[in-house]
Structures are given as structure tokens and as C-alpha cells.
């Protein structure tokens, strides 16, 4: 039967018997956290033969091999995935080998198989037959293939059982144990799978079948399963569900979420039944199992109980997540915060209305509003007292409220109130009465003009650019000299410059005042000599890359009319030359024929330019008489058995340093310095392996129910 | 474990009503929904409705809709199922059932805890 909706068996290796009846698991399989040693040799479940998401084995204490386990296990369908992974094989102390030797397909996602320190039987699997990519294994620190000594069947007596495949370059037998071979279908039957007997299965099959060319006898679907039969679609009136099976309409409408109510059953959609409308699709009405597209983003109403909703944390912003309408009052007061713009910008951003009012107080983390990128409308329904539905107050940062430009934003009912925010210009107070149409309603004393932008450089004169040259890495740029009236208050220019894929950037993007800043800064002294115009060198840049660029004048705080003159420049971009693209990744080659060899590989991760061409070179290569040397099958050859001690492997070096000349004198070597790239991908590799385990820890661990 | 006791099952006339109680035990905390399916001489067993424990959301087969009601007694722990309108094709064993699942799907092997079963017969 059908179990689900994932099983997790954990700390008591008796509760595997829920996996009794069976036969395809619709969802994951976890069993981990079993520290006590058992015999699981009494514990068999062969009618289990497809899990349609993942398999994951954390810390299972005595248990040997899976074969015996899960002798009939022939698909992993990885509909969802555990970290990219569909397959995960984690500290598994006593694991000795995988075993599942009727697994042929995992129809999507990468295997990770990492810390299993007497783990053998891994470099005998061709993993290529079971995966479409190979590239995205990940198997480490298991234990080294030389202490394991792996033998498939009747390698030893001289009459190998196995088939051979070539895996980077190494023609061997496939096996997954001592005694069970990696099943192969014969090239005839191309992609399709094969039956015990190697005839071939009915193209809808999918890993195996019980009789040739026959859609009611597969292990296993390819595409989908309805009543018996693999389909490559749904027949009308069913719909495809979990990725792998069609169920009729009243199927899906019985489907129930453990805390859903009433309104909230599953939905039919693009002939698929789901939990929920995807993205960009809104449900018919209340009670409807059928969606329709939103027009925009997909309305979210969220509510404050107590009408106001305080701002004063990454932690309260982020209950605001995904709403475009917020029923009442906004009152944001962050003081401070780490990375706070773009993070705000995360949770709000798709804020379009706000039925009440918008305060914004003792905000000194703040330099921009941008962050509410997509609010459009203030309602007032509900105002502060002297009718203010937009009150900012005391951001001793605040120096920009959106970019006018690209902003259409109104307030339908009450009055705007400025007051203290000394880097806020009184013009962009006035734009922002004529944008939100809300010019006439203040009084005199609604925008005060001696306390707002009374420290900022608020009468703007342009720097222009004069001059702009690229390579691959650098950009040159010159502007005009700046001359204020009096040329001592000119102290210097900063430049500021970031990557730019699209020209949609504003000065303010990512800024807080908290140190947070998504543009790079550079100080640029005066020229000594007058007559020379200011520039800069911009280098360690990336190739082929567009970068944004803009110039600031710093000036002495030289009042003018209650206010200080400043220049800056537009945002200019530039792109950098092209250049050398990075090596092309995972060269894989493999022989079809004694005449033809396959080689693929996948783009490089810096292409540095637009790719035209791939160049693919060979040469013919002397056959290694190392291979020969030694007979392998002689029992005094195989090496020692060690335990590993499930830590990442480093190959110890065995012979003696080998005797080169270095540097002009005969001598033993050593080993090359690593290079920064080496070093760099070291540094990723233990950073990555570090996500990972906190990932899985995140995702297992959880709290007991009370 | 979960211990699922059903009672109430019997003979009766079609047309008439009977009504199914099914009482949990144990780790009751475990469970997300209750079901009643149902088994008939020869055939799979199916799926007659369900509930959920938290907020009481109900969900049930096409054939027996508007003729039986589903509901819950958080206090007692127990479940009932209340079936009017009895025709001779409901004739077969009600099974009481439960599950620890965040998604609860018509399909058997979603649950993890069953009943005995109660038989239930309606003459014609």
C-alpha cells in the first residue's frame, strides 16, 4: 500500500515495522538518531520499492548494510529534496555497505554520502546509471578506498560476475556488495529499464518490471500511475499528485492540512493537485479548488490586532512577509540593526497599502524609505492627532524618502508632518507633497524648514564625468573639477561604485546608517595642481561586468541661506571588458565504442564574455603498466583494514618523497604551495560541508511533543 | 501508542441510523486527524471521511455525502460517526483510524494507528 506522507523513524529501531505494508512511500524516509546497537537482521521489507522524495540515514547505530533492509528499493523519485540531495548517507558509524542492489533509478536531485567511517563498496557503484549528473555528488570522508580492499563477486576465484563500466578513466566491475552486482541493462534497450532477465521493460517503466513490454507490470512509472498502468499523462478528469500518481477530483477534494479549516483544502490546478495556488495565482473565491491568475502581485491582507503594528526589528518586520495590504497602522521606529535596509526591504517590500496612518520615528537606522518599495497608497482611514496620516519624526539619518522618479505613491486622507530629521532636504519633502497629492493640506508648521536638512548638502550641483576607459579588470574614470564659491571648503571626492547587472540602481540601495552598504567606497584627494581634473583607478574589478559609478563632493558644512551646497554626480554605468572565461567544470569522458569516446562537460563558472565556442583537444595515450604490476586478487594485497575515522580524507603519502631536481640541485621536493584559488576552494568546501550539517541538524532535530 | 476502540456497529433496517464512537488512548498528543474507512466481503478497504483534531475540518467520500456526519469530543477523546439514511451497499466492517500526519490524504496508508473494526449490516 501507499504510506506517507513521509515517515520518520526515529529513536526506536522497532518503529520500522510501520514500513510492514509498504510499497511505495509517498514522501520521505528518515530513520536516524537510533544510538543503541540492534540486530536488524529479523527486520525485511521487500515489498517497498519506490520513495518519492528523499532517503535520509543519520546515526544509526549497528546497522550494516540497507540491502537487507530494503532488498526491492529500485526507485528514489526525489520530487522533493533534502538539500538538493535525494539520497543522504550521513555518520552512519557501522554502515559497511549501501547494498540497495535493486536501486536503479533516482529520478532527481544528487546523493550525499559523507562522515560514514566504515563505509565501503563506494568507488565499485556507478552512481552514472542511476543518476542523470554525477557532478553533484557529494562523497566524502567515508572510509579510503585502499583500506577497503572492495571485491565484487568472483573477482577472487578469477570468474568475475559483474559488468564493467569506466568511471573517470577506470575500467571495473560494478557491484554493491561482496555478493550482489550493479544490475545493467543491455545497450538495446537504451534508456529503458529491463527485466531480471534482460528483456527489455514498456518505455513507461521505470527502473524494472516483471515482464517485457507490458505498462501494468512495472516496478515503478516513469511518468505517472492510474489504476494499475503507467501513463505518460493523467487520463481527463484525474490529476496528477506527489509527482508520480493521478487521483480523481473527489480524491483531491478529501485531501486536508492538519491545522487547514474548512476553506483551505487542496486545490486543482494545471492538472495538478496541490496544496496550495503557486505563485502568482490566487484561489476563485473562499471555498473554490481552482485558481486564477493575480493580477499583480498576489493580494495578502494581514491585520494587527491591536490596529498599530510597531517596526523596531528585523524580528517584527518579518511578520509582515509576503502581504500587500496591511489593515491598520504602521509605526516603524529601528534604531538600530545590522544589514537592516535590505532586510526590511525583504519583508515589506511588497507593502502596497496601508489602510491607516505611516510614523516613522526615531528611525537613526534609517537613510532611505526605499525599502517599502512597492507602497502606493496611504489610506488615513485612521490618523494620528491633528489629522496626520504620514508623521516623520527625529531620523537623525534619513536623507532620501523614495526616488520621485520611479514612484507613484498617495495619500488619500490627512496631512504630512516633518520634523527633526537634519539630513532630510525640504525639497524631497516638497516633491513628495506633489507626487502623493497631498500639496495644500499642511500647515506652516506640518514641514519645518530650519530642523529638516539642516546637515545635509541639500542645493546639489552635478559633478560631470570627463573621461571613462575599461579592461578586463580596471575602470578609469576622470570628472570635472568641482569649484565651490569658496574653493577651501572642497576637502575631497568619494568615489562609489558596486555591480550592476541591470541599470535600475539608486544612491540609497542597501544603506543603513548602521554601517551597512551595498556600494564600495573609495576616497579621492585633490590633484595638487589646479588645472588637473580628479580621477581614479577602479581595480580587482570582474571581467565582462557592469558596474554602477557615481561621485561625491565632500565640503565643508560652508552654510548658505540656512543650507549647504554639495556636488554629485549621475549614476553612471560600465561595463568591463571581456576576458579569459574560468576552466569548463565536470569533464566527463566515457568510451561508447572502440572508436568513439563521449566527453561532456558543463560551462565554466566565469565565463568572463559572451561563449562562442568550445575548443576540445586529445591525444592518444600510452597504456599504464603500473595496472599490471601487481595481481590484486592475492589475498596479501589487499591492504589492512583500518577504522577511518569519519573525517574528511587527506591521501597519505606511503613512499618515500619522490627525488626530483629542485631548483637546480638534486633533492627530495616538496609539495607546492597551495595557490590562492586552492586555498579559496578549501575554504568554500569545509564552508559548504558546514551549511550542510547545520541544515540537517536544523531540519531533525526537533522538540519532543508535550 | 495510539488505542483505537470502536462500538456501536449493528443490524439494522435500510433507511435507518446508527452511530459509530471511537475513543483513543495513549499518546493521544500524537495525532493530527481521525478517520473512519470502511471494508465490505471481497473488496479494498475505503475511505468514508475524516477529522481534524485541531480545528474539527471535515472531509468526506462522495458516497456518503449529506447522509453521515463526522464530529469529535476533545474531552472524551473520541470520534463518532453518524450515519442516516443507511442503504444495503454500506454494509461492511467500520474501521476507526488515526494519524500523526501534517498532510492527511483519503489514502489508507496515511494512517499509522487502527481499530479492531465494528460491524455494521443493513438489511433491505
Known amino acids: 500500500e501507499i504510506c506517507g506522507p513521509g515517515i520518520d523513524i526515529r529513536n526506536d529501531y522497532q518503529q520500522l515495522k510501520r514500513l510492514e505494508n509498504c510499497t511505495v512511500i509517498e514522501g520521505y524516509l528518515h530513520i536516524l538518531l537510533i544510538s543503541k546497537a540492534e540486530d536488524y537482521r529479523s527486520y525485511r521489507f521487500p515489498k517497498l520499492t519506490v520513495i518519492t522524495e528523499y532517503l535520509l540515514l543519520f546515526r544509526v547505530a549497528g546497522l550494516e548494510s540497507l540491502g537487507d533492509l530494503f532488498p526491492n528499493l529500485t526507485v528514489i523519485r526525489g520530487w522533493k529534496l533534502f538539500y538538493n540531495y535525494a539520497l543522504v548517507i550521513f555518520e552512519m558509524t557501522n554502515l559497511k555497505d549501501i547494498g540497495l542492489y535493486n536501486l536503479r533509478n533516482i529520478t532527481r536531485g544528487a546523493i550525499r554520502i559523507e562522515k560514514n567511517a566504515d563505509l565501503c563498496y563506494l568507488s565499485t557503484v556507478d552512481w552514472s546509471l542511476i543518476l542523470d549528473a554525477v557532478s553533484n555528488n557529494y562523497i566524502v570522508g567515508n572510509k579510503p578506498p585502499k583500506e577497503c580492499g572492495d571485491l565484487c563477486p568472483g573477482t577472487m576465484e578469477e570468474k568475475p560476475m559483474c559488468e564493467k563500466t569506466t568511471i573517470n578513466n577506470e575500467y571495473n566491475y560494478r557491484c554493491w556488495t561482496t555478493n550482489r552486482c550493479q544490475k545493467m541493462c543491455p545497450s538495446t534497450c537504451g534508456k529503458r529499464a529491463c527485466t531480471e532477465n534482460n528483456e527489455c521493460c514498456h518505455p513507461e517503466c521505470l527502473g524494472s518490471c516483471s515482464a517485457p513490454d507490458n505498462d501494468t507490470a512495472c516496478v515503478a512509472c516513469r511518468h505517472y500511475y492510474y489504476a494499475g498502468v503507467c501513463v505518460p499523462a493523467c487520463p481527463p478528469n484525474t490529476y496528477r499528485f506527489e509527482g508520480w500518481r493521478c487521483v480523481d477530483r473527489d480524491f483531491c477534494a478529501n485531501i486536508l492540512s492538519a491545522e487547514s479549516s474548512d476553506s483551505e483544502g487542496f486545490v486543482i490546478h494545471d492538472g495538478e493537485c496541490m496544496q496550495e495556488c503557486p505563485s502568482g495565482f490566487i484561489r476563485n473565491g473562499s471555498q473554490s479548488m481552482y485558481c486564477i491568475p493575480c493580477e499583480g502581485p498576489c493580494p495578502k491582507v494581514c491585520e494587527e490586532e491591536k490596529k498599530t503594528k510597531t517596526i523596531d526589528s528585523v524580528t517584527s518586520a518579518q511578520m509582515l512577509q509576503g502581504c500587500t495590504i496591511f489593515k491598520g497602522n504602521l509605526l516603524i521606529n529601528i534604531r538600530r540593526g545590522n544589514n537592516i535596509a535590505s532586510e526590511l526591504e525583504n519583508f515589506m517590500g511588497l507593502i502596497e497599502v496601508v489602510t491607516g496612518y505611516v510614523k516613522i520615528r526615531h528611525s537613526h537606522a534609517l537613510v532611505s524609505l526605499s525599502f517599502l518599495k512597492n507602497l502606493r497608497l496611504i489610506l488615513g482611514e485612521e490618523q494620528l492627532e491633528g489629522n496626520y496620516s504620514f508623521y516623520v519624526l527625529d531620523n537623525q539619518n534619513l536623507q532620501q524618502l523614495w526616488d520621485w522618479d520611479h514612484r507613484n505613491l498617495t495619500i488619500k486622507a490627512g496631512k504630512m508632518y516633518f520634523a527633526f530629521n537634519p539630513k532630510l532636504c525640504v525639497s524631497e519633502i516638497y516633491r513628495m507633497e506633489e507626487v502623493t497629492g497631498t500639496k495644500g493640506r499642511q500647515s506652516k508648521g506640518d514641514i519645518n524648514t530650519r530642523n529638516n536638512g539642516e546637515r545635509a548638502s541639500c542645493e546639489s550641483d552635478v559633478l560631470h564625468f570627463t573621461s571613462t576607459t575599461t579592461s578586463k579588470n580596471r575602470i578609469i574614470i576622470t570628472w570635472h573639477r568641482y569649484r565651490p564659491p569658496d574653493y577651501r571648503d572642497l576637502i575631497s571626492f568619494t568615489v562609489y561604485y558596486k555591480e550592476a547587472p541591470f541599470k535600475n540602481v539608486t544612491e540609497y540601495d542597501g544603506q543603513d546608517a548602521c554601517g551597512s552598504n551595498s556600494w564600495n567606497m573609495v576616497d579621492v584627494d585633490l590633484p595638487p595642481n589646479k588645472d588637473v581634473e580628479p580621477g581614479i583607478l577602479l581595480h580587482g574589478l570582474k571581467p565582462w561586468t557592469q558596474y554602477a559609478v557615481y561621485v561625491k563632493a565632500v565640503t565643508l558644512t560652508m552654510v548658505e541661506n540656512d543650507h549647504i551646497r554639495g556636488a554629485k554626480s549621475e549614476i553612471l554605468y560600465i561595463r568591463t571588458n571581456a576576458s579569459v572565461p574560468s576552466i569548463p567544470l565536470d569533464v566527463l569522458s566515457a568510451s561508447n565504442s572502440s572508436s568513439q569516446l563521449i566527453v561532456k562537460w558543463n560551462p565554466p563558472s566565469l565565463p568572463n564574455g559572451n561563449l562562442s565556442y568550445y575548443i576540445v583537444r586529445w591525444q592518444r595515450q600510452p597504456q599504464d603498466g603500473y595496472l599490471y604490476r601487481h595481481n590484486y586478487c592475492s589475498k596479501d594485497k589487499i591492504p589492512i583494514r583500518k577504522y577511518a575515522d569519519g573525517t574528511i580524507d587527506i591521501e597519505e603519502v606511503t613512499e618515500n618523497p619522490k627525488t626530483e631536481v629542485c631548483g637546480g640541485e638534486k633533492g627530495p621536493c616538496c609539495a607546492c604551495p597551495k595557490t590562492e584559488a586552492e586555498k579559496q576552494a578549501e575554504k568554500e568546501e569545509a564552508e559548504y560541508r558546514k551549511v550542510f550539517e547545520n541544515f540537517l541538524h536544523n531540519s531533525i532535530f526537533v522538540p519532543r511533543p508535550e | 501508542q495510539v488505542k483505537l476502540e470502536e462500538s456501536g456497529g449493528g443490524l439494522v433496517q435500510a433507511g435507518g441510523s446508527l452511530r459509530l464512537s471511537c475513543v483513543a488512548s495513549?499518546?493521544?498528543?500524537?495525532?493530527?486527524?481521525m478517520a473512519w474507512f470502511r471494508q465490505a466481503p471481497g473488496k479494498e478497504r475505503e475511505f468514508v471521511a475524516t477529522?481534524?483534531?485541531?480545528?474539527?475540518?471535515?472531509r468526506y467520500a462522495d458516497s456518503v455525502k449529506g447522509r453521515f456526519f463526522i464530529s469529535k469530543d476533545s474531552a472524551k477523546n473520541t470520534i463518532y460517526l453518524e450515519m442516516n439514511s443507511l442503504e444495503p451497499e454500506d454494509t461492511a466492517v467500520y474501521y476507526c483510524?488515526?494519524?500523526?500526519?501534517?498532510?492527511?490524504?483519503?489514502?489508507?496508508?496515511?494512517?499509522?494507528?487502527w481499530g479492531q473494526g465494528t460491524q455494521v449490516t443493513v438489511s433491505s
Open positions: 483510524a488515526a494519524t500523526a500526519a501534517a498532510v492527511i490524504t483519503p489514502t489508507r496508508g496515511y494512517y499509522n494507528y
Open positions: 495513549g499518546r493521544t498528543f500524537s495525532r493530527t486527524a
Open positions: 477529522i481534524t483534531w485541531n480545528s474539527g475540518t471535515t
